[in-house]
């Protein structure tokens, strides 16, 4: 499961930079599987915020990406995540790239990492 | 029914390392649900979370930062319990000491406490 | 580090009072954020975390709310067993600091 949901994540991060055309040269931060979840490529200024993963749910490759950016075009907008929730972890895209999560996964989530015996 | 045991010295010298212990039964060190904690609670710093440690198919730790140049917290898992090492103490490590279990349900909390210690730091 | 404060620092009440205790955050915590009640010379007990989700085996007469920076902790008719010091517990950023505590005695 976690080397499927690993390529799934691979996969949307390849649409998304064809959708927003992102490429290596693009300013911003790429999208990245970072062991626990997706983050989508981003621009800089933007905020990533993500749900808590379900530890073994199946990603669809076809469903919509399950993060949300925050911009100023996504202001009120009520279907987005909000880094008020709990179950919420956020990323900011910096020009030096992205920042570490926050909360940590661990406080946020209750685990910081897929764990290597199941 | 879960229970945690603390034990050791109530006077440490300053400069010198507090060491405590807390055994726990009706659980696990090796819980991979629980974390294990140290707490303080003194008049002048009121209560104080001091690390944790707990295992997910490896041991790992978090410690607070004002103390994690000095701590190191150690489970042991033949006898179920873990421990407290906190060095270089000064008066102002004068506090009872608490051992709890965290579980997580939404967010961490300490659920489960030990009966506490008080440790002095005097000559 | 994240600054919880309480108010008030002490109260006294009545049994079958109604009280209010708050706790403040320095910054957003969403509902990170737990209640223990603590007797002289004994460990605290956790009563709510998550901010309003009451422990296994805690009396319904008390109950957490709030979210982000404010926070109450409300008890519905005190009960002689009920006064304590309660302290509120940040758990969304290491380190997880404590409130200084709300002191309940006797009127």
């Known amino acids: 499961i976690f080397k499927k949901e690993q390529a799934m994540c691979l996969e949307k991060i390849q649409r998304a930079n064809e959708l927003m055309g992102f490429n290596d040269s693009s300013p911003g931060c790429p999208g990245m599987w970072d062991n626990i979840t997706c983050w989508k490529p981003a621009h800089v200024g933007e905020m990533v915020l993500v749900s808590c993963p379900e530890l073994f749910r199946i990603f669809n490759p076809d469903q919509v990406w399950e993060t949300e950016t925050i911009g100023e075009s996504d202001f009120g907008d009520s279907n987005s995540l909000d880094l008020s929730d709990m179950g919420v972890v956020s990323r900011n895209c910096t020009e030096d790239g992205w920042s570490e999560p926050f909360p940590h996964y661990f406080d946020a989530c209750g685990f910081d990492e897929y764990e290597s015996e199941t | 029914q879960v229970q945690l045991q603390q034990s050791g010295p109530g006077l440490v010298k300053p400069s010198q390392t507090l060491s405590l212990t807390c055994a726990i039964s009706g659980d696990s060190v090796s819980s991979r649900q629980a974390t294990w904690n140290w707490i303080r609670q003194s008049p002048s710093r009121g209560l104080e979370w001091l690390g944790r440690?707990?295992?997910?198919?490896?041991?790992?730790?978090h410690y607070a930062v004002s103390v994690k140049s000095r701590i190191t917290i150690n489970p042991d898992t033949s006898k179920s319990q873990f421990s407290l090492q906190l060095n270089s103490v000064t008066p102002e490590d004068t506090a009872v000491y608490y051992c709890a279990r965290g579980m997580w349900q939404g967010n961490w909390f300490l659920d489960h406490w030990g009966q506490g210690t008080l440790v002095t730091v005097s000559s | 580090d994240i600054q919880m404060t309480q108010s008030p620092s002490s109260l006294s009440a009545s049994v079958g009072d109604r009280i209010t205790i708050t706790c403040r955050a320095s910054?957003?915590?969403?509902?990170?954020l737990n209640w223990y009640q603590q007797k002289p010379g004994k460990a605290p007990k956790l009563l709510i975390y998550a901010g309003r989700i009451l422990q296994s085996g805690i009396p319904s007469r008390f109950s957490g709310s709030g979210s982000g920076t404010d926070f109450t902790l409300t008890i519905n008719s005190l009960q002689p067993e009920d006064f304590a010091t309660y302290f509120c517990q940040q758990a969304i950023i290491n380190p997880y600091t404590f409130g200084p505590g709300t002191k309940v005695d006797i009127k």
């Open positions: 910054q957003s915590i969403s509902r990170y």
């Open positions: 440690t707990y295992y997910r198919g490896k041991w790992k730790n």
